[in-house]
Interface confidence: medium
Amino acid sequence: EAHKSEIAHRFKDLGEQHFKGLVLIAFSQYLQKCPYEEHIKLVQEVTDFAKTCVADENAENCDKSIHTLFGDKLCAIPKLRDNYGELADCCAKQEPERNECFLQHKDDNPNLPPFQRPEAEAMCTSFQENPTSFLGHYLHEVARRHPYFYAPELLYYAEKYNEVLTQCCTESDKAACLTPKLDAVKEKALVAAVRQRMKCSSMQRFGERAFKAWAVARMSQRFPNAEFAEITKLATDVTKINKECCHGDLLECADDRAELAKYMCENQATISSKLQACCDKPVLQKSQCLAEIEHDNIPADLPSIAADFVEDKEVCKNYAEAKDVFLGTFLYEYSRRHPDYSVSLLLRLAKKYEATLEKCCAEGDPPACYGTVLAEFQPLVEEPKNLVKTNCELYEKLGEYGFQNAVLVRYTQKAPQVSTPTLVEAARNLGRVGTKCCTLPEAQRLPCVEDYLSAILNRLCVLHEKTPVSEKVTKCCSGSLVERRPCFSALTVDETYVPKEFKAETFTFHSDICTLPDKEKQIKKQTALAELVKHKPKATEDQLKTVMGDFAQFVDKCCKAADKDNCFATEGPNLVARSKEALA
């Protein structure tokens, strides 16, 4: 229903705390360079204004759209052009073009220092002094680094952060309590960020239809007892919610997400037997719990999928009369039977089925033509299964760091033109798939591996799009979203690449490496490894192993030396010479 004042309506629905958090996220995602203090001032102004509209919906400007109100606030910031350059040109446009313009200026890789977690004592002090400000900083710092982070989910992580600090700051050993718990929240949040970016990419590049197909497959896997009409309703709602969040309509998105959770909890009987535990929780936790819900049990008496989609003589009639509904039903039926497949794979199978019907229904004997379609799915299913098997075996053999290095070599050979920091980030993330998925039961491995890899490769594509350097990467990134992972997997050594000149300074290290945390040390070594591959793209595994082993020993030796600087200065050139020789 239409409301006189959209902002008053959202404020009343969401409550002041969530309203303020979402406005802060929205501003931080649009203007990523502004300091917290500047954003919090705007948030307070917007909140005060919303309160006046709650008191009187007819008050001046209360009838304006939220985009108009937010955009006007952003455009009133002094020195906008100095700080944001051409983003300031957006302010000359009218809504909805102005908001579209803001969205186009979101930076997936803003030039911001990595988010450093303060010392445990300092954290607890500042949290206890002002919890609201502390959590506001958290929202701001995450949102500006991840401009497409799913806003209601970020509120959930802030709540988790709050819980951890409340619990750990009373402990005697605060660091021992905080570190593992905050690491876990951070890990989950980072995965959530890449997954949501993938959803927004899907929406931006391929539109709502593609996203809805993804949602139908996902919902059908989770709720195999729900009927197609129910799945369609849920998929339509999820598509609307994600469209809103990806489009910067964060208040509407969070409000609609809460509504969907309410609907699901009121209709458990027709959706899933697993929802009850989630439905007893408060709103943010309820929505998050429902989003992560385990699959319901598959109905025992499902007939063969062939009956409706291959053996039925009306297949072509069904397809011709209402293509999307028919294909949607196919996707639903196939997905509810296969929680062990990735959504990407299910969408590839649906695409194959569609292509088969397009071809066969135009022929003289359609049933004879499409009769073998299910058998033709086999190679499409085998390919990701083999990918999981070989990669998990390699992970089990090498461990996470070694597996990351193997992936880094592989991807540097596939796309040596891509910047080293981007390759290292991608390989580290791709390499985490082992820890995340390979330890799961067999039936959960494939969906975990492939859907996670797809999200990480989407991040690679998003970064590459900003500064395209590799034709092969552009080709894989331009195609369909579900074909990306197989496309990248199929890439081989780029034969067109002219190897990089060997620069001694790239492999020159100083004693500062000794005091770096383990993660930073790994990144330094992996940076050197990528540079080695760029210098010698066809280096063998043994050659690279020799050089990297030598390098690790050199760092270890010099970090233990009494005069570290002298050791690095004298041993470094020897290492470079030996490395050149080993790779000759």
């Epitope: 009927e227 009409a229 028919f326």
Partner: nanobody, 126 residues
Framework: EVQLLESGGGLVQPGGSLRLSCAAS????????VAWFRQAPGKEREFVAG????????YYADSVKGRFTISRDNSKNTLYLQMNSLRPEDTAVYYC???????????????????WGQGTLVTVSS
């Protein structure tokens, strides 16, 4: 759960007409793929006509095409089968069957329908 109740059967002369009704409860009939099947004494149950759920796409067995018409009245939650030009070979017990949540697909395979009425007898004889 879906409950189905057929009515409208009876004795009719060859060339005559009958209209069968199937009242549904427990589910909106427009969301459900529904069909009429029939079973003559000593024969297999066979598909007669069907209509998709959510999309009014109709299906007929070759033997009844042009003579029978399937329709539904969503406001009354009822399915109909208008039978014209009846022949002695149309004599059978007519059953109404439903496949909830099935847009379009009205399969002709009886086993795929989980819900059935108790049937109404149609006799075509002079």
């Amino acid at each position: 759960e879906v409950q189905l109740l057929e009515s409208g059967g009876g004795l009719v002369q060859p060339g005559g007409s009958l209209r069968l009704s199937c009242a549904a409860s427990g589910r909106y009939i427009d969301e459900t793929a529904v069909a009429w099947f029939r079973q003559a004494p000593g024969k297999e149950r066979e598909f007669v006509a069907g209509i998709g759920g959510g999309v009014d796409i109709t299906y007929y067995a070759d033997s009844v095409k042009g003579r029978f018409t399937i329709s539904r009245d969503n406001s009354k939650n009822t399915l109909y089968l208008q039978m014209n030009s009846l022949r002695p070979e149309d004599t059978a017990v007519y059953y109404c069957a439903a496949r909830p949540g099935r847009p379009l697909i009205t399969s002709k395979v009886a086993d795929l329908y989980p819900y059935w009425g108790q049937g109404t007898l149609v006799t075509v004889s002079s």
